[in-house]
Amino acid sequence: DFFRDEAERIMRDSPVIDGHNDLPWQLLDMFNNRLQDERANLTTLAGTHTNIPKLRAGFVGGQFWSVYTPCDTQNKDAVRRTLEQMDVVHRMCRMYPETFLYVTSSAGIRQAFREGKVASLIGVEGGHSIDSSLGVLRALYQLGMRYLTLTHSCNTPWADNWLVDTGDSEPQSQGLSPFGQRVVKELNRLGVLIDLAHVSVATMKATLQLSRAPVIFSHSSAYSVCASRRNVPDDVLRLVKQTDSLVMVNFYNNYISCTNKANLSQVADHLDHIKEVAGARAVGFGGDFDGVPRVPEGLEDVSKYPDLIAELLRRNWTEAEVKGALADNLLRVFEAVEQASNLTQAPEEEPIPLDQLGGSCRTHYGYSS
């Protein structure tokens, strides 16, 4: 197949940087993060979308590994579990140094490309992981967090999630609370990518308006193609274009076809739509492999990216457009975020008001002074 051969040629030079992979969650779920369990060997790991041979076959050159803790940990052990998931990513990279290069910058990604390794970055999936604390946010940055998804599928005290737009959650922050605005400003200051997957439309718009740097949707598709509220509506796609931001398309069947079955061609329809509305510079891939129960026919695991690239070439995407979607768009956005950062600027210090802090098992030190 000419197009498949072309896809491989392009990807040898420009491997894919994927915005969201939940292998760390699988390592917790299957092995309680015991990487030395013989079944957890990533060269032979079975029953997952992701392992080392599949990453190699798929020309995956960069991966934001998802550090995720479920919403029921909010106001409980969310921070502990977040640290444990960051730790498993660090240990995974140290255990397979011939495959993974742990990096925290766009320059690091380029270095991994040169070494033929999978640039491995940490994305923290859900604002509840910071427990409404700017100090925790900064600590997670020091430990390698390079994107923060502002919410998962639950509101935080400072940002609203997508289920507000389905009628399944009540709005609390009308997008971003004043503390949520401080979180966005601190993420900008630190040079952390802001991820708007999982957030409400009001939160998307508020953040796109406030952020001094481009943002990403690490694993979201196009609402006009499938009317799931996990997808990005056209008016927001136009804001994505205005802000030079990025939508990394999720492959979950129910967000692709709005049914339990989907195929590779329908994923390409989402990519086409985002390209049409937001421009080729706004397109990326965030497959959500190992984080979803159903993936499209033709995209069964991470080895299948070249088949998707072949389909885009078949649809007359140019080589430059394809390279943009594979890596260049993410690198551009990441570099813009890094350039907008200012670590010499005074950090945000004003804590969340005590009456906005959820949870009953808390002390109130500092608030009484």
């Epitope: 289920l163 389905t166 009628g167 399944d168 009540e170 009317a227 799931s228 509220r229 709005c258």
Partner: nanobody, 112 residues
């Protein structure tokens, strides 16, 4: 089997009214927010309206505000969309959906 079945569509003149229904089965209807979306010929999906679990919160697209009313009857496992002052640009297939499933749709045509 989780299912949503829309009904009540048809041909109506501009300025006329229709009431769409959506019958739910296979899940606890009263535990989910519900939404109407529509798709005009050759166009993408467009959000129309959403109602919260209890029915206390309703939201509407600007294009239908003050003309359409969403409601639900949790005892009957049914979602409704009352459409008044219909316009030709309201012509579309109307779908009800929640986070679990989307229905097959019902055609609404507004034409004189």
């Amino acid at each position: 089997q989780v299912q949503l079945v829309e009904s009540g569509g048809g041909l109506v003149q501009p300025g006329g009214s229709l009431r769409l229904s959506c019958a739910a089965s296979g899940f606890t209807f009263s535990s989910y927010g519900m939404t109407w979306v529509r798709q005009a010929p050759g166009k993408g999906f467009e959000w129309v309206s959403t109602i919260s679990i209890s029915g206390s919160r309703t939201t509407y697209a600007g294009s239908v505000k003050d003309r359409f009313t969403i409601s639900r009857d949790n005892a009957k496992n049914t979602l409704y969309l009352q459409m008044n002052s219909l316009k030709p640009e309201d012509t579309a297939v109307y779908y009800c959906r929640n986070i679990l499933v989307q229905g097959q749709g019902t055609q609404v045509t507004v034409s004189s």
